[in-house]
Amino acid sequence: DWVIPPISCPENEKGPFPKNLVQIKSNKDKEGKVFYSITGQGADTPPVGVFIIERETGWLKVTEPLDRERIATYTLFSHAVSSNGNAVEDPMEILITVTDQNDNKPEFTQEVFKGSVMEGALPGTSVMEVTATDADDDVNTYNAAIAYTILSQDPELPDKNMFTINRNTGVISVVTTGLDRESFPTYTLVVQAADLQGEGLSTTATAVITVTDTNDNPPIFNPTTYKGQVPENEANVVITTLKVTDADAPNTPAWEAVYTILNDDGGQFVVTTNPVNNDGILKTAKGLDFEAKQQYILHVAVTNVVPFEVSLTTSTATVTVDVLDVNEAPIFVPPEKRVEVSEDFGVGQEITSYTAQEPDTFMEQKITYRIWRDTANWLEINPDTGAISTRAELDREDFEHVKNSTYTALIIATDNGSPVATGTGTLLLILSDVNDNAPIPEPRTIFFCERNPKPQVINIIDADLPPNTSPFTAELTHGASANWTIQYNDPTQESIILKPKMALEVGDYKINLKLMDNQNKDQVTTLEVSVCDCEGAAGVCRKAQPVEAGLQI
């Protein structure tokens, strides 16, 4: 049987080497001489020769300093043979434990740790964690028991201990109030990790803490009073630029300004934010009227895109806006004037007076009137009074110039301001009808076939309006009824049917047709009738020689 005491060897031993560890014995040595040998890692396999054994005495020796952090345990096998070389024992496993010395200082996992914390954070708020490791034995010794401390803080303001570190975990927390990004945007901490629970080997690293922004600063007007002027009637005109400063982080929602006009019930102004420099650009939202109000005193408040994190006073500014008088065009009242007038209104008589009002009540101005559009040249205007008269006869049935019984003329009024301003009015003459048009047939040229002629419909047209139109009366005159007949085509008597009484020779005929409207205004019209060499409905007319004059009735 083997006699092997537990074997441990401290790392980093000084020597001299080789150094005795233990003496191995086999109790078979009582029966005869026993020779010892070892095999395994550190003996005959790499690292070879770290351990040796005296062949005859069994003293196990170490030949060099050990490094626990490289190899913490060696597994060897001891062998015992007699002088004839026969094994007297089965091989025995030997475990050599390398005991730890505190020969490794902690190492931080990073040289620089980065963290962030909101300004104004409450004490107790975790900021970041630093971590160090130690290669020494943390199971059986305190050689790797790391304790963390903060060695320094830069800046040491507003307190030299703004942060604290959990000595066991390396978690850095806020310990004091007063973190203010606008005063101290970053802190640099030198942190230490020391083993032996803080009493041993140590190393340092840097923790850089960025204080992040909250909206704890209001935008402030500088200056707080502004003056501007704007011409009347012009929308989207820049009046003035409002300046603000905000100590929060630029180009963030906590810095970006939002402007509100506190006393603009009419929505006449608007303030937009210049995204580059945060200026407020005050503009007109709609045209202002000098004659109604010459000056506005606006109160403008400024806040941020996001709400204030803390209770802050909202900054306000006063803007005095002077409205500048501009020469405005005269305004016709009404802008569109309707006048009913009979189409037989006497030439040279006054139809109506159409005048404009001068909006510039603070300027004494003279208005001059002119006709701008009068396509039929029927009208003239008194340049001083705006009285409109006829210069020619009106005609409701002049369909080139009159639409739906309405004749449209444009009148302009010009003041004598600087620069001159011109306003336009629309005059609508509603022409009432006079029975000045007799009925006429349509068509006036008619074709019949010589054989089996088809009766032809003739429409009766009157340019006038009822009651100066249908029902119409039709009558053949000058002997036409000898060869032709007419009859009404419909109850309104707005068309007639013409047909020959007998077979007619091919040729041209003239028929006198008298048409009379409902008010007995009549007119005789000559119809041009052609009889063609065909049958039924007249198509393309192939005429024979003209009919002799005697037949043309």
């Epitope: 409450l122 307190d159 000595r167």
Partner: antibody, heavy 117, light 111 residues
Framework: EVQLLESGGGLVQPGGSLRLSCAAS????????MSWVRQAPGKGLEWVSA????????YYADSVKGRFTISRDNSKNTLYLQMNSLRAEDTAVYYC??????????WGQGKMVTVSS | QSALTQPASVSGSPGQSITISCTGT?????????VSWYQQHPGKAPKLILS???KRPSGVSNRFSGSKSGNTASLSISGLQAEDEADYYC???????????FGGGTKLTVL
Amino acid sequence: EVQLLESGGGLVQPGGSLRLSCAASGFTFSSYAMSWVRQAPGKGLEWVSAISGSGGSTYYADSVKGRFTISRDNSKNTLYLQMNSLRAEDTAVYYCASWGTGTLWPWGQGKMVTVSS
Amino acid sequence: QSALTQPASVSGSPGQSITISCTGTSNDVGAYNYVSWYQQHPGKAPKLILSEVNKRPSGVSNRFSGSKSGNTASLSISGLQAEDEADYYCSSFTSGLPWVLFGGGTKLTVL
């Protein structure tokens, strides 16, 4: 002299409301987090609420969350505790205290709040 | 149930020394050197007597001293006097909210 002075305590019925004030003097009030700590009769100290120096961050114990509101007016150097929906178990002496570095100091003299019908 | 554990009571005769313990965890007492002790006489507000384990504010007697080992802090009072009879509370900073933990209090009786 550094001093905190509470006011506003008294007797209130269950479900009622009360506002405590704490006037600070002798130190830069806006630089310090402030706390309310209460002590029920014959009991230990219980942390109730806290607020950062700027007033931007607040904390409430679970027992008062949703019922109590802490606020401060740095222009008046005053801390407030608005207590709504009061219960019998809210009966205690309420102290305001300033948080220095790692410790609560100074403390106010305390105000008794009694919730009883 | 308080976060930090203190004995409910201790007593001593005038002139003697006593120690009051305050036991927490590795996340509060054991993690930070921000342990404070407060003295409270009946009907009065707590008074700070030690901060940062062993720092005495001005005006506090040097008979009061503090120490810390691992997760336990201790308040020692030497040369006990009648006016030392009071309740004593420990507190510790901790990461998170609330950032202060209180002990349940210890009643000191001077016999």
